[in-house]
């Protein structure tokens, strides 16, 4: 798997992907905000 995330539970894997997606969205928004403020 691409980034070393390992779990034996499929639902836990889906949860990890959901968290990763959320963090990507939050960090993406922050980055866009910083660029905008410059």
């Amino acid at each position: 798997h691409s980034d070393g995330i390992f779990t034996d539970s499929y639902s836990r894997y889906r949860k990890q992907m959901a968290v990763k997606k959320y963090l990507a969205a939050v960090l993406g928004k922050r980055y866009k905000q910083r660029v905008k403020n410059k």
Epitope: H1, S2, D3, I5, T7, D8, S9, Y10, S11, R12, Y13, R14, K15, M17, K20, K21
Partner: antibody
Framework: EVQLVQSGAEVKKPGSSVKVSCKAS????????MHWVRQAPGQGLEWMGL????????RYAQKFQGRVTITADESTSTAYMELSSLRSEDTAVYYC??????????WGQGTLVTVSS | DIVMTQSPDSLAVSLGERATINCKSS???????????LNWLQQKPGQPPKRLIY???TRESGVPDRFSGSGSGTDFTLTISSLQAEDVAVYYC?????????FGGGTKVEIK
């Protein structure tokens, strides 16, 4: 309603590779868990692996580790399953399937791959 | 891997009679999220499988209520309360709790 359309039947020589495609419509492709399952003639079902396209994150069944590669092209909403070092036992119908509520709610029509010399 | 054992391998039932298929897993399918990812598929000849029941007992929309699923932990059952001609198919249980995802060997249901 998600629809999955797979590529056509293939005949391959032992030792070669095959790449099967699965085009999704009617859903947010990048946010789907796309699985591949195969079924040898007259046999049961066997899970091969999955991809989560938004991160191109993959998980493979131990049995196929090192021999299978699942990829996705978000621009065309298409997933691919490539199986290498083919042998006669790989003759099977290969299905793509999409997870919903932790089970496979939508299935492609299947792609028959025949491995023969 | 989790081993899914289905019984019987085949089943011949008269029209209108009850058909019961059993599925046993080699370890509990109860996940840490409190859900049990035990599913049933129906496959007719020349067709892809179709989701019938998921999360042990939730029927897929459009599936007749003569189909029901029950069980917990390691022991599960699919019941067809009154077999119809269109129910002739192979039925598979499979688990989506643990990697690697695994399937039972299938039960072929026929008309007696």
């Amino acid at each position: 309603e998600v629809q999955l359309v797979q590529s056509g039947a293939e005949v391959k020589k032992p030792g070669s590779s095959v790449k099967v495609s699965c085009k999704a419509s009617g859903g947010t492709f990048s946010d789907l868990y796309m699985h591949w399952v195969r079924q040898a003639p007259g046999q049961g079902l066997e899970w091969m692996g999955l991809i989560y396209p938004i991160f191109a994150d993959t998980r493979y069944a131990q049995k196929f580790q090192g021999r299978v590669t699942i990829t996705a092209d978000e621009s065309t909403s298409t997933a691919y399953m490539e199986l290498s070092s083919l042998r006669s036992e790989d003759t099977a119908v290969y299905y793509c399937a999409i997870d919903q509520d932790g089970s496979f709610a939508y299935w492609g029509q299947g792609t028959l791959v025949t491995v023969s010399s | 891997d989790i081993v899914m054992t289905q019984s019987p391998d085949s089943l011949a039932v008269s029209l209108g009679e009850r058909a019961t298929i059993n599925c046993k897993s080699s370890q509990s399918l109860l996940d840490s999220d409190g859900k049990t990812y035990l599913n049933w598929l129906q496959q007719k000849p020349g067709q892809p499988p179709k989701r019938l029941i998921y999360l042990v007992s939730t029927r897929e929309s459009g599936v007749p209520d003569r189909f029901s699923g029950s069980g917990s932990g390691t022991d599960f059952t699919l019941t067809i309360s009154s077999l119809q001609a269109e129910d002739v198919a192979v039925y598979y249980c499979w688990q989506g709790t643990w990697f690697d995802l695994t399937f039972g060997g299938g039960t072929k249901v026929e008309i007696k």
